[in-house]
Amino acid sequence: AGVFELQIHSFGPGPGPGAPRSPCSARLPCRLFFRVCLKPGLSEEAAESPCALGAALSARGPVYTEQPGAPAPDLPLPDGLLQVPFRDAWPGTFSFIIETWREELGDQIGGPAWSLLARVAGRRRLAAGGPWARDIQRAGAWELRFSYRARCEPPAVGTACTRLCRPRSAPSRCGPGLRPCAPLEDECEAPLVCRAGCSPEHGFCEQPGECRCLEGWTGPLCTVPVSTSSCLSPRGPSSATTGCLVPGPGPCDGNPCANGGSCSETPRSFECTCPRGFYGLRCEVSGVTCADGPCFNGGLCVGGADPDSAYICHCPPGFQGSNCEKRVDRCSLQPCRNGGLCLDLGHALRCRCRAGFAGPRCEHDLDDCAGRACANGGTCVEGGGAHRCSCALGFGGRDCRERADPCAARPCAHGGRCYAHFSGLVCACAPGYMGARCEFPVHPDGASALPAAPPGLRPGDPQRYL
């Protein structure tokens, strides 16, 4: 067990041209805070993958207001170290992500707002118990200077915090075969109680008779490098056929449980029992709790009452991410229906609706005919946000209030003459034609293509076909 410690020395503009604008202003004073995420090994994992070695948030720094016209200086930093406790052996190689966050303290609706200012990442080798290592990382135009170290918590010592020390039993020297514990010269290395043959370089134990492996090693005695093991079946074929030096790893060999979790085999895989402060399939997630205030931008922290349980952030509309740190373009979800225009006002979403539609999301198709009467027996027809009247014969106009001239469209064919009539129109056909619209020629022999005209009507008389 031990603690990884991070000391931020400065955060400000990097060297060279293109100095960044100050993140704070007189109108928007702000303050900084930092988040560190640690992962074992030299993995190049996504920023969102679990911080398997642990994570920590700093306190908020002092409030800073930009001096008008002055270049962005190094910004005031929070006091103290960021400390990430680890319960298991220190892996020796690790990846880190350090994020610089800005908390704006202006007149935001809903109080402070947070935004990610810079994120740096790297992969390092580090022995526990060593001196502070200094580092400089750049993110865009920003530069972050920091130091870090890993130290063991008593009684653990050594480069991986796996050796145990105990106070001396005799005042002058350690017992037979036991060395003083550097740098704690007044203590002695505890007697070795690991399984016989357990690799002193790659294995360790916390209970008598066990042999637990550091990352990258496997086998009952932690003597097989994971990368060179060619035993693929759950227990590995015999060494005679594959050249494996030891039986192949079982699900718990090499202890897949991080942070001091204990592994037990299940019929199909393994199960980790995690120590207080860690959770996840492999105890890989560090115990940041709701008390640390991890939810930004008005997010509500749910669960995570103690380090044994995970927290989640329920984000207000408009934000997402595991800590509600990402602003969502809510209009990209196309919430406005029926062609409405979306406006994201920050504190609310507005839809500007097309004619004929209403409602917060333009979801209501207005009844275009409501309260609109069509005169003279016309009927109202809805459509696309406008209404129109289908008028009775002899009437026209938007509301069927205008008396229509049925002859305006010249409906009588072949030179027939049109007469308006109370129930429609009448065509007086030219000689040689007949029909309601004078559309049928009369045959030369006098026979008609249609039934003969009704009695009393000569072919040249006006005809009405109802």
Epitope: Q108, I109, G110, G111, P112, C290, A291, D292, G293, C295, F296, G298, L300, C301, V302, G303, G304, A305, H314, P316, P317, G318, P335, H347, A348, L349, G359, P360, R361, E363
Partner: antibody, heavy 118, light 108 residues
């Protein structure tokens, strides 16, 4: 402006299920989280739980085993069901909208008194 | 859960006076996620302050909020007759959301 109206029976028998509905007007139910809060006569306000249009819910642990809050986006309504009620559940029940900048309550219904009695 | 304790329980004052109401949290309320409400008899609560110090829409500027961490206050600079009501604080830092039990402001 968002307006909320609670509806449901004012009298429920012990051991039965209390059911209330809140109808939202002046705002889309898809824009906010929606919550229920209660206040026993002469006592403190108690948060019951909330729902988001996506179906996300969160309940007060003291009531979690008995509470269900659901949302009906087509009707712009959300509802509360509280099972196995006792006289201690007698209260004015309020529905409220949760603000878009944090989990506080910016609009409230006028409240409906539910009495648990046989 | 965060327990909010409001004091005093009841306060008798006259119109025109200045009043300060206290809300103390059992644990730190991060990010000033604290709101204040006013409840008049027979009515629903009404939002006054959010983010510990931001006034809600339509709230007169005689109402102001302050504080951080575990100690928060609501101040009414000059009491009007309609201000006599019960005032509640509520934290929205973590679940469960919790209210204080209120301070009743009555006319002396």
């Amino acid at each position: 402006q968002v307006q909320l109206q609670e509806s449901g029976p004012g009298l429920v028998k012990p051991s039965e299920t209390l059911s209330l509905t809140c109808t939202v007007s002046g705002g889309s139910i898809s824009s906010y989280y929606w919550s229920w809060i209660r206040q026993p006569p002469g006592k403190c306000l108690e948060w019951i739980g909330y729902v988001y249009y996506s179906g996300t819910t969160n309940y007060n642990p003291s009531l979690k085993s008995r509470v269900t809050i659901s949302v009906d986006t087509s009707k712009n309504q959300f509802s509360l069901k509280l099972s196995s009620v006792t006289a201690a559940d007698t209260a004015v029940y309020y529905c409220a909208s949760i603000a878009v900048t944090g989990f506080y309550f910016d609009y409230w219904g006028q409240g409906t008194l539910v009495t648990v009695s046989s | 859960e965060i327990v909010l304790t409001q004091s005093p329980g009841t306060l008798s004052l006259s119109p025109g006076e200045r009043v300060t109401l206290s809300c103390r949290a059992s644990q730190r309320v991060n990010n000033n996620y604290l709101a204040w409400y006013q409840q008049r008899p027979g009515q629903a609560p009404r939002l006054l302050i959010y983010g510990a110090s931001s006034r809600a829409t339509g709230i007169p500027d005689r109402f102001s909020g302050s504080g951080s961490g575990t100690d928060f206050t609501l101040t009414i600079s000059r009491l009007e007759p309609e201000d006599f009501a019960v005032y509640y604080c509520q934290q929205y830092d973590r679940s469960p959301l919790t209210f204080g039990c209120g301070t009743k402001l009555e006319i002396k």
